[in-house]
Interface confidence: low
């Protein structure tokens, strides 16, 4: 069989969007199965046609309705004949069109008046490709060969740049790159004191707009009154937008405010946020816990606890805890220094202890009081050896 590509030079140049028809002539075979190959891969093309010239002469057509850049390459036709594959001479298809961008200008964020560069690259064919830069609607500079780098000395407001690529086939316009102006960040917001103890406070906040420059750190300033002397200033790297304030004074009113900084500088401070540390739990245990048996039950008494430090705040109520060796146990809260105990089994030993509480919690427990089943009244001291506490 004889194969040859007809009507096509070794190199074929076509404009993008134009139709192309490649012809392949096969002689010496009846109804040959002509396959078209592009760059070594068989072309699956529904526009493949066969026309018989005579019984043993066929022409195959490969029709490309509208060529694209991706259609460019090396084509040949081939047929199977007696278990062997015969191939024709190849044809090189070049697709020309307006320039194709391989690099387009990217959006940037820059400080005011800072120099920056934008890049643009486009290719043919046909070459050469020249680049023209636009700033908004103004052409800046004459055509330059591709690739092109635009050096800008600086901008003072958000500015749009684009490039235009020209070749013999026409022009193509790139995407618009917006060069945003970096600015100081906005003040943080939603500042919340998330956890409080007597000496620590956890703070969280939401960052304001970053001014299109990465936030680097935030400063938490703490005073004992808004605008008063600074007690504490903590600089924290971000994210996360949280901070632990340590070594605060218990039961004290504080105010805090937060600002965040990017490479250009700090944001304004957010509004002051007041908070109060918790006081201390009571330091003393009630003394002289004793019991008096009555016909109706058991009365427990103890001495009133006087606050040792103002940071403890007001004391009271008292919390009473009792347990029996049969497993019965209970707690009760009383306002005074006397409690009437009911619901206990007089046939079993009873162990009682008491603590005084405040807004923070309960202070230390008193010495346990053991009321023996055979006692008429209890005594304070170590529990009976039978009783585990």
């Amino acid at each position: 069989a004889g194969l040859k590509l007809m009507g096509a030079p070794v190199k074929l140049t076509v404009s993008q969007g134009q139709p192309v028809k490649l012809n392949c002539s096969v002689e010496g075979m009846e109804e040959p199965d002509i396959q078209w190959v592009k760059d070594g891969a068989v072309v699956q093309n529904l526009d493949q046609l066969y026309i018989p010239v005579s019984e043993q002469h066929w022409i195959g057509f490969l029709s490309l309705k509208s060529v694209e850049r991706s259609d460019a390459g090396r084509y040949w036709c081939q047929v199977e004949d007696g278990g062997e594959t015969e191939i024709s001479q190849p044809v090189w298809l070049t697709v020309e069109g307006v320039p194709f961008f391989t690099v387009e200008p990217k959006d940037l964020a820059v400080p005011p008046n800072a120099p920056f560069q934008l890049s643009c690259e486009a290719v043919g064919p046909p070459e050469p490709v020249t680049i023209v830069w636009w700033r908004g609607t103004t052409k800046i500079g004459g055509p330059a060969p591709s690739p092109s780098v635009l050096n800008v000395t600086g901008v003072t407001q958000s500015t749009m740049f684009s490039c235009e690529a020209h070749n013999l086939k026409g022009l193509a316009s790139s995407r618009t790159a917006t060069v945003h102006l970096q600015a100081l960040p906005a003040a943080p917001f939603n500042i919340t004191v998330t956890k409080l103890s007597s000496s620590n406070a956890s703070v969280a906040w939401m960052p304001g707009a970053d001014g299109r420059a990465l936030l680097q750190s935030c400063t938490v300033q703490v005073t004992q009154a808004p605008g008063g002397w600074e007690v504490l200033a903590v600089v924290v790297p971000v994210p996360p937008f949280t901070c632990l304030l340590r070594d605060l004074v218990p039961a004290t009113n504080y105010s805090l405010r937060v600002r965040c900084a990017n490479a250009l500088g700090p944001s304004p401070y957010a509004d002051w946020v007041p908070f109060q540390t918790k006081g201390l739990a009571p330091a003393s245990a009630p003394q002289n816990l004793h019991a008096i048996r009555t016909d109706s039950g058991l009365i427990l008494e103890w001495e009133e606890v006087i606050p040792e430090a103002p940071l403890e705040g007001p004391l009271g109520p008292y919390k009473l805890s009792w347990v029996q060796d049969n497993g019965t146990q209970d707690e009760l809260t009383v306002e005074g220094t006397r409690a009437n105990l009911t619901g206990w089994d007089p046939q079993k030993d009873l162990i009682v202890r008491v603590c005084v509480s405040n807004a923070v919690g309960c202070g230390p427990w008193s010495q346990p009081l053991v009321v023996s089943s055979h006692d008429r009244a209890g005594q304070q001291g170590p529990p009976h050896s039978r009783t585990s506490w």
Epitope: V98, W134, F161, S162, C163, E164, G170, S173, T176
Partner: antibody, heavy 125, light 108 residues
Framework: EVQLVQSGADVKKPGASLTISCQAS????????ISWVRQKPGKGLEWMGQ????????NYGPSFQGHVTISADRSTATAYLQWRSLEASDTAMYYC??????????????????WGPGTLVTVSS | SYELTQPPSVSVSPGQTARITCSGD??????AYWYQQKSGQAPVLVIY???KRASGIPERFSGSSSGTMATLTISGAQVEDEADYYC???????????FGGGTKLTVL
């Protein structure tokens, strides 16, 4: 004064072809993108695509690619939106829009300022 | 394809603050724009580049953007602010633009 004058309302049957127009005046037609925005009855705005008349370069929204063709005639400063085969779901108001910024080299205009009055297209059998 | 997500409706009493949100993955890199459309009219630009008020728009309208969320705020909403509001932005590579689904603001 910038003006975008759109063609009148049209009623078509499914399968018919249609071209609606948007004639611009009051500015240099080739310096600005013209975009088309669809609004179905009682529904939201949908960005369809756009053309820069200077280079006849077009961009389409993913759901409109292949279904409509946007073109422009520089000599008459007119942009067109064309359907080869209308469907009932094409029933909508179509706005042509000119961006506020001059973005002659750009791909997407930053934002819209001048809106045409809209062309109501009804596709019904 | 890229999407901008808005709540379908927001209701406020006159004088209250209305907030309409718009979320999209590309909003950290791309500006948000807000349009107001009153019944039977073409849309009107309200806010551009996240936070700039368009000419002729009252000061009670403001915009902000943080991360993937843009917000239109109407401080002291008035009955005449009742309308549909749309956010608008680009997909990350700037290949096409998108409107949000729209939010119907009711000022009761």
């Amino acid at each position: 004064e910038v003006q975008l004058v759109q063609s009148g309302a049209d009623v078509k049957k499914p399968g018919a072809s249609l071209t609606i127009s948007c004639q611009a005046s009051g500015y240099t037609f080739t310096d600005y993108w013209i975009s088309w925005v669809r609004q179905k009855p009682g529904k939201g705005l949908e960005w369809m695509g756009q053309i820069v008349p200077r280079a006849s370069r077009t961009n389409y929204g993913p759901s409109f690619q292949g279904h409509v063709t946007i073109s422009a005639d520089r000599s008459t400063a007119t942009a067109y939106l064309q359907w080869r085969s209308l469907e009932a779901s094409d029933t909508a108001m179509y706005y042509c829009v000119r961006p506020y910024f001059q973005t002659s080299g750009g791909t997407i205009p930053e934002y819209y300022q001048h809106w045409g009055p809209g062309t109501l297209v009804t596709v019904s059998s | 394809s890229y999407e901008l997500t808005q709540p379908p409706s927001v209701s406020v009493s006159p004088g209250q603050t209305a907030r309409i949100t718009c979320s999209g993955d590309a909003l950290p890199k791309k500006y948000a724009y807000w349009y107001q459309q009153k019944s039977g009219q073409a849309p009107v630009l309200v806010i551009y580049e996240d936070e700039k008020r368009a000419s002729g728009i009252p000061e009670r309208f403001s915009g902000s953007s943080s991360g993937t969320m843009a917000t239109l705020t109407i401080s002291g909403a008035q009955v005449e602010d009742e309308a549909d509001y749309y956010c608008y932005s680009q997909e990350r590579n700037g290949n096409y633009a998108v409107f949000g689904g729209g939010t119907k603001l009711t000022v009761l």
